[in-house]
Structures are given as structure tokens and as C-alpha cells.
């Protein structure tokens, strides 16, 4: 299992997905949307 | 202007496969993850998943028990929905969509107009 | 998975009054102060809209009017006062945890 994790700490393994708090300027992910900090680094 | 543009309606066969697709345009296509979402004829909203164009990845609703599909192509900016042993019940409008997190200082909507996917024998 | 349950199914309000819509969810949808509760517009022949999230944050363009309420499983949208284009369904949608899921909608009519 991965990890899927909002900014505020709350997490859950779900499916083979890492998930995790990423500046979008740093250009490493995808936006997932309607949470805080979530995006799709791999 | 950011704009989700999706492929016409289909009419399919049970048990036959449906490919959706959703054209991203206006905005930088890797950055932003794409959802599916699903309303039966006179329905309510359901959420299939979503893939991230950046890296391919997706997060599908377990409730299509691996009978969903989502792909992309960085190429054309392009997210395809396959949708398998299709059966009356997935008579629905299919639309993609695009969020912005909380986080961003402002939140908005993006969606495709919706394709209309018919399973009749 | 949350279950969401809104309430009334359907509301019929004249132009001009106060139209409220709840939401229960099966679980608590919030999470270190914040919930994950958005609220959408719908109507007739076009895709959803959002208007709120959050629980209680406007979306992009949307009027004052509109506004969200609530914390945990229990929330709520109100139309402070109705008009004529705010006939639609609406429905309310919790984003904490996957699968996403969506209430069954509450159709807003003119009384």
C-alpha cells in the first residue's frame, strides 16, 4: 500500500497511489482538488 | 479560457466497451488531475475516480470492480475513460472535470459538456 | 465508504424567501478544522457547478446569497433569497476520503 495524505496530516493507505502536501510550483505533481495540498507525485 | 472538450454520444451493446475521451485545453494539461463522474438518466452525481495526467497514475471507485479504464495522452492533452461489460445500468451521462485544491486561494470548477453513453440491446 | 443523505428530497420557495438544504454524512468529514464538504449547483442539461467549499467558502463567482454552514457530519446550504435562476437540483459532496461521494440531491422549485 501507498500513502495518501491531506496537509493537515490526515492519512489513509489506499490503493497503489502516493499522495502528499507538494508546492505546485515545484512542478512534481498533479493538482487532485477539493483537499489541502494534495497532489499526485507518483 | 481553461475548456474540457469530450467525444459525442455513444450507443453500445451489453457487454461491449465505451472509451470517453476529455480534450484539456487553456492550461498547463499535467498539472491538474481530471475526474469522471457519472449521472444516470433523472440520477444523482457518482464519482468513477481520477488520473493524473503528470504521471498516469489513477484512483478508480471500487465499485466498478476493474471494469474502468483511465489513461492519457500527453501528446493532445487528452484523458480517456474505458468503461467494460457495460450493462443497462450504466446508461448514464459521463462528465469530466477539473478542481482546484482548498489551498489555492481560489476554487474552481472546470467540466466537459458530458457524453451520453446508451447500453440498450 | 461515507455515505451522504440531503434533505428535503425537493423544496418549493417563493421568490424572495430563505431556501435551506441539509446534509448528514454517514461519518465525519472533517479533519484538523477543516471540512470537506462542497455543495454544487445543477441544472437542466449542464454539468454541476460548485458554489461551496469547504462547508462554508464561496467558489469563483458565485453570489452572495449563497452561503454553507456546518462542521462534522451535519451541514447545511442556504439560499438567502431565492431567485428565479436558482431553480436547479443541488447537491452536497464530501472530498476526505476516496471514493469520493455525492448526496442524492435536493431539486429547488418556485412555490
Known amino acids: 500500500d501507498a500513502e495518501f495524505r491531506h496537509d493537515s496530516g490526515y492519512e489513509v493507505h489506499h490503493q497503489k497511489l502516493v499522495f502528499f502536501a507538494e508546492d505546485v510550483g515545484s512542478n512534481k505533481g498533479a493538482i487532485i482538488g477539493l483537499m489541502v495540498g494534495g497532489v499526485v507525485i507518483a | 479560457q481553461v475548456q474540457l472538450v469530450q467525444s459525442g454520444a455513444e450507443v453500445k451493446k451489453p457487454g461491449a466497451s465505451v472509451k470517453v475521451s476529455c480534450k484539456a485545453s487553456g492550461y498547463t494539461f499535467t498539472t491538474y488531475a481530471i475526474h469522471w463522474v457519472r449521472q444516470a438518466p433523472g440520477q444523482g452525481l457518482e464519482w468513477m475516480g481520477f488520473t493524473s495526467p503528470y504521471s498516469g497514475v489513477s484512483n478508480y471507485n471500487q465499485k466498478f470492480k476493474g471494469r474502468v479504464t483511465m489513461t492519457r495522452d500527453t501528446s493532445t492533452s487528452t484523458v480517456y475513460m474505458e468503461l467494460s461489460s457495460l450493462r443497462s445500468e450504466d446508461t448514464a451521462v459521463y462528465y469530466c472535470?477539473?478542481?482546484?485544491?482548498?489551498?489555492?486561494?481560489?476554487?474552481?470548477?472546470?467540466w466537459g459538456q458530458g457524453t451520453l453513453v446508451t447500453v440498450s440491446s | 465508504d461515507i455515505v451522504m443523505t440531503q434533505s428535503p428530497d425537493s423544496l418549493a420557495v417563493s421568490l424572495g424567501e430563505r431556501a435551506t438544504i441539509n446534509c448528514r454524512a454517514s461519518e465525519s468529514v472533517d479533519n484538523d478544522r477543516i471540512s470537506f464538504l462542497n455543495w454544487y449547483q445543477q441544472k437542466p442539461g449542464q454539468p454541476p457547478k460548485l458554489l461551496i467549499y469547504a462547508a462554508t467558502k464561496q467558489g469563483t463567482g458565485v453570489p452572495d446569497r449563497f452561503s454553507g454552514s456546518g462542521s462534522g457530519t451535519d451541514f447545511t446550504l442556504t439560499i438567502s433569497s431565492l431567485q428565479a435562476e436558482d431553480v436547479a437540483v443541488y447537491y452536497c459532496?464530501?472530498?476526505?476520503?476516496?471514493?469520493?461521494?455525492f448526496g442524492g440531491g435536493t431539486k429547488v422549485e418556485i412555490k
Open positions: 459532496q464530501q472530498s476526505k476520503v476516496f471514493p469520493w461521494s
Open positions: 472535470a477539473r478542481f482546484d485544491n482548498y489551498d489555492r486561494g481560489y476554487v474552481r470548477d472546470y
